[in-house]
Interface confidence: low
């Protein structure tokens, strides 16, 4: 197997879409698989076409974290396997901006994924660090939820409430609209009581370097950094 066109590395903004191309040839026509950070690609769309002994594979991704994407072309001559690899990195420009920047506005939640969790007509904080805050934050919830994959029935509603209230934070309107973070106690209850096993899995992933923890914290809060309801009951939101 021989790679004719290797995927290209990209430096993109958070919430962008990227299409990675990989073209290979060989006799017989090779198969192409994509690897993300050492594992099979868990999300994204793969399209393939074969013409004149050339296979073209396109992986389209919604970028919420940096990663190393490897295209592996394999074919088999008799008992012998032939493999070719090519890799590309996806890095995120200004990836920490949404964390640091509190610029945004209050608006009624009009999305779908958090409909059952957020109060009807809830005022949420939309972060103007994103080009399209509603769409970006909505997709961020989806992506974060995919990270949880298989969760227990006990964890699911608690995690859903935590994610939705963290990404679509309650908004305090005023001259400077302000997001109201979740109270530390509620975050800890989800982490240590309802979703202890699941949380461990996510932290394990972070330690293994599968994604930068700062990026990861955009979707799952770091409980210790949240305000306590005992300090100021109005400074944080209760789930």
């Amino acid at each position: 197997a021989r790679i004719l066109r290797a995927p290209e590395s990209h430096n993109v903004t958070f919430g962008s879409f990227v299409t990675l191309h990989c073209t290979a040839t060989g006799i017989p026509v090779p198969t192409i698989t994509w690897i993300e950070n050492g594992n099979a690609v868990s999300s994204g769309s793969i399209q393939e076409s074969v013409k004149d002994r050339v296979i073209d594979s396109r992986l389209q991704l919604f970028i919420t974290k940096p990663g190393l994407y490897t295209c592996i072309a394999t074919n088999k001559h008799g008992e012998k396997f032939s493999t070719a690899k090519a890799a590309a990195t996806i890095s995120i420009a200004e990836w920490s901006k949404p964390q640091k920047d509190n610029k945004g506005y209050c608006a009624q939640y009009r999305g779908e994924v958090c409909n059952a969790v957020l109060a009807k007509d809830a005022l949420v904080f939309l972060n103007t660090s994103y080009a399209d805050p509603e769409e970006a934050q909505e997709l961020l919830v989806h992506t974060a939820w995919n990270e949880l994959k298989v969760v227990s029935p006990v964890c699911r509603p608690a995690a859903e409430a935590l994610l939705c209230n963290h990404i679509f934070q309650e908004c305090s309107p005023g001259v400077v609209p302000t997001p109201i973070p979740i109270c530390r106690e509620y975050c800890l209850a989800v982490k240590e009581l309802f979703c202890a096993k699941e949380w461990l899995v996510m932290e394990e992933k972070t330690h293994r370097g599968l994604y930068r923890s700062e990026m990861h914290l955009l979707s799952v809060p770091e409980c210790s950094k949240l305000p306590s309801m005992h300090w100021d009951p109005t400074a944080c939101a209760r789930l």
Epitope: T19, R58, Q60, E112, A131, D132, E135
Partner: antibody
Framework: QVQLQESGPGLVKPSESLSLTCTVS????????WSWIRQPAGKGLEWIGR???????NYNPSLKSRVTMAVDTSKNQFSLKLSSVTAADTAVYYC??????????????WGQGTLVTVSS | EIVMTQSPATLSVSPGERATLSCRAS??????LAWYQQKPGQAPRLLIY???TRAAGIPARFSGSGSGTEFTLTISTLQSEDFAVYYC????????FGGGTKVEIK
């Protein structure tokens, strides 16, 4: 060969709802995202929204409050409902297949289009 | 919303000549761009996706190029059946189309 066919009333009264159905043949409706796109006479194309059979959907923000999409997998059909229509909703309505899987893509198969006129 | 701007609005070309159509995005869309051809009374037909990949069954005289915000569709040798309206469409965020370029016989 994938084929899409739109059907529905050609005339709708203002303030009422426009309802269209798209019948897909030559492909399983469960395998792709499916979109609705419209084109007012002599003008450009406007994407209305799309859905996947699992219930995941995305809508054009400017139309979102008025749009509902549904699917009948047993008939390999999907539908569009646009409420509170005005004369500005008069257009040729197309159904189309989204060529990519999970994320937005290009539209590789289209229906022939059906003209909907909003008039009293 | 990502706004797509096409130019020129009308392009007058003689059969056998080369036609170059431009499309500009209001922000970077990487290579998430498609081109369509539409003839009167017909649905659009996909020509190019991912900015430069020809769709199935599209003749080699159609080619696409560009990335980021500037894109070009080139028809190397115009045939009589190529006179139509051409639209670009981005799919980096929710899909939006350009206003179209009409390619007419000179």
């Amino acid at each position: 060969q994938v084929q899409l066919q739109e059907s529905g009333p050609g005339l709708v009264k203002p303030s009422e709802s426009l309802s269209l159905t798209c019948t897909v043949s030559g492909d399983s409706i469960s395998s792709y995202y499916w979109s609705w796109i419209r084109q007012p006479a002599g003008k450009g194309l406007e994407w209305i929204g799309r859905f996947y059979t699992s219930g995941r959907s995305n809508y054009n923000p400017s139309l979102k409050s008025r749009v509902t999409m549904a699917v009948d997998t047993s008939k390999n059909q999907f539908s569009l409902k646009l409420s509170s229509v005005t004369a500005a909703d008069t257009a040729v309505y197309y159904c189309a297949r989204d060529g990519f899987g999970s994320y937005f893509g290009s539209f590789d198969y289209w229906g022939q289009g059906t003209l909907v006129t909003v008039s009293s | 919303e990502i706004v797509m701007t096409q130019s020129p609005a009308t392009l007058s070309v003689s059969p056998g000549e080369r036609a170059t159509l431009s499309c500009r995005a209001s922000q970077s869309i990487i290579s998430n761009l498609a081109w369509y051809q539409q003839k009167p009374g017909q649905a659009p037909r996909l020509l190019i996706y991912d900015a430069s990949t020809r769709a199935a069954g599209i003749p080699a005289r159609f080619s696409g190029s560009g990335s980021g915000t500037e894109f070009t569709l080139t028809i190397s040798t115009l045939q009589s059946e190529d006179f139509a309206v051409y639209y670009c469409q981005q799919y980096n965020k929710w899909p939006t189309f350009g206003g179209g370029t009409k390619v007419e016989i000179k």
